[in-house]
Interface confidence: medium
């Protein structure tokens, strides 16, 4: 007879889950020459233990200290660049301005980008079929805690300017419900954080709007100024002119505005 | 054939300086991760300091801010400068390259330089 | 002070089995990787093991290695007289930044 099993609203496990996390961590250490010592397989066994056996409804941040504790690692703090609903973009911009960081540049964040997991109480099987959906199901499934861990501490790390990319193409170019605006906006330290700095990314080439008038950003500018952290905000017109530019400085069109 | 030549060993007087040097030949300095360890008498290994591929440095606490690792690219040629020397730094001094990749221990050593650190 | 814990000594007879431990903690061991050199007398060490299990070439596969947790071991089986020698146990230590290798255990081929 099949055992009755739990079925989510959300999409199931990523195929190849266990192989695709362990390949990416060997990966990782051999790029990273400051983390190439990190024992690949006990970051595996750390990440299984936070979930395996578990109901993937009663996660919690606890459950993921043993992966933190493996997975530590010291980015420069005033190198750190958060993102909001525009994750390709703010890739692109670390890719070209390699001494800047995204969550998923860190080992952690690299190992869990865009994977989906979630396992089954009281058994040690992954469940490919279905996974808990944050809104219909619940929030404390095993992927919304890990990112919620991984964002606070990495948000905790950061000093002096921090810089957060948003899209100025989404109706709530800074949402309180986003990862950065929930989690990564309260845990930036006030005496270790002197600026938020947002670049707002427009959408449209004809889009000459000023953005950061925008009635969320002057929400994120009054949560942030209430904090004791200055806040400062910066249109970013021209998106591909701007990783251009980055890529090339010198250029002459890059005096100009972007 | 890969092997490394250390050399710059001897007698010195507490509180003076003294620089080593790790000839590398087979493969280049620059292009891996190069260690240096020391051995006191009858003791045994101490990790000294490590200079990365891409010239990040780090020291062992009990040398940190004396000793000084470096490399010469067109020398092939890896050094460690000694300051401040004390009757514990007496030892055998070797480099070893440890390879830059998954695997990464310590796979080619040289045959040690004798470090003497008396008055 | 070593932070890696290994016996002082261990001895076997030719063709015996010896293993020896080696002890850390979580920001050693616990989390990275762990090689094992072999020092001849009045030799340079040599690499014996690397990432945990893994012979380098030219190492006989009667040298293995494991590691559970925040300890690691290596085992010799079938003893020869030119095993003697000293062992080192290695592993990067996160809190302190560098390098830790063990004590040294001095093997003894009776």
């Known amino acids: 007879v099949p055992r009755w099993r739990q079925q989510w609203s959300g999409p199931g496990t990523t195929k190849r889950f266990p192989e695709t996390v362990l390949a990416r961590c060997v990966k990782y250490t051999e790029i990273h020459p400051e983390m190439r010592h990190v024992d690949c397989q006990s970051v595996w066994d750390a990440f299984k233990g936070a979930f395996i056996s578990k109901h993937p409804c009663n996660i919690t941040e606890e459950d993921y200290q043993p992966l933190m504790k493996l997975g530590t690692q010291t980015v420069p703090c005033n190198k750190i660049l958060l993102w909001s609903r525009i994750k390709d973009l703010a890739h692109q911009f670390t890719q070209v301005q390699r001494d800047m960081f995204t969550l998923e540049d860190t080992l952690l964040g690299y190992l869990a980008d865009d994977l989906t997991w979630c396992g089954e109480f009281n058994t040690s099987k992954i469940n490919y079929q279905s996974c808990p959906d944050w809104r219909k199901d619940c929030s404390n499934n095993p992927v919304s805690v890990f990112w919620k861990t991984v964002s606070r501490r990495f948000a905790e790390a950061a000093c002096d300017v921090v810089h957060v990319m948003l899209n100025g193409s989404r109706s709530k170019i800074f949402d309180k419900n986003s990862t950065f605006g929930s989690v990564e906006v309260h845990n930036l330290q006030p005496e270790k954080v002197q600026t938020l700095e947002a670049w707002v990314i427009h959408g449209g080439r004809e889009d000459s709007r000023d953005l950061c008038q925008d009635p969320t950003i002057k929400e994120l500018e009054s949560i942030i100024s209430k904090r004791n952290i200055q806040f400062s905000c910066k249109n970013i017109y021209r998106p591909d002119k701007f990783l251009q530019c980055v890529k090339n400085p010198e250029d002459s069109s890059c005096t100009s505005e972007i | 054939q890969v092997q490394l030549v250390e050399s710059g060993g001897g007698l010195v007087q507490p509180g003076g300086s003294l620089r080593l040097s790790c000839a590398a030949s087979g493969f280049t300095v620059s292009g891996n991760y190069m260690n240096w360890v020391r051995q006191a008498p009858g003791k045994g290994l101490e990790w000294v300091s490590v200079i990365y591929s891409g010239g990040d440095t780090y020291y062992a606490d009990s040398v940190k801010g004396r000793f000084t690792v470096s490399r010469d690219n067109s020398k092939n040629t890896l050094y460690l400068q000694m300051n401040s020397l004390t009757a514990e730094d007496t030892a055998v001094y070797y480099c070893?390259?440890?390879?830059?990749?998954?695997?990464?221990?310590?796979?080619?050593w040289g045959q040690g330089t004798t470090v003497t650190v008396s008055s | 002070q070593s932070v890696l814990t290994q016996p002082h000594s261990a001895s076997g007879t030719p063709g015996q089995r010896v293993t020896i431990s080696c002890s850390g903690s979580s920001s050693n061991i616990g989390g990275n990787t762990v090689n094992w050199y072999q020092q001849l007398p009045g030799t340079a060490p040599r690499l014996l093991i690397y990432t945990n299990n893994k012979r380098p070439s030219g190492v006989p596969d009667r040298f293995s290695g494991s590691k559970s947790g925040t300890s690691a071991s290596l085992a010799i089986s079938g003893l020869q007289s030119e095993d003697e020698a000293d062992y080192y146990c290695a592993a990067w230590d996160n809190s302190l930044k560098g390098y830790v290798f063990g004590t040294g255990t001095k093997l003894t081929v009776l």
């Open positions: 070893a390259r440890e390879y830059s990749g998954y695997y990464y221990g310590m796979d080619v």
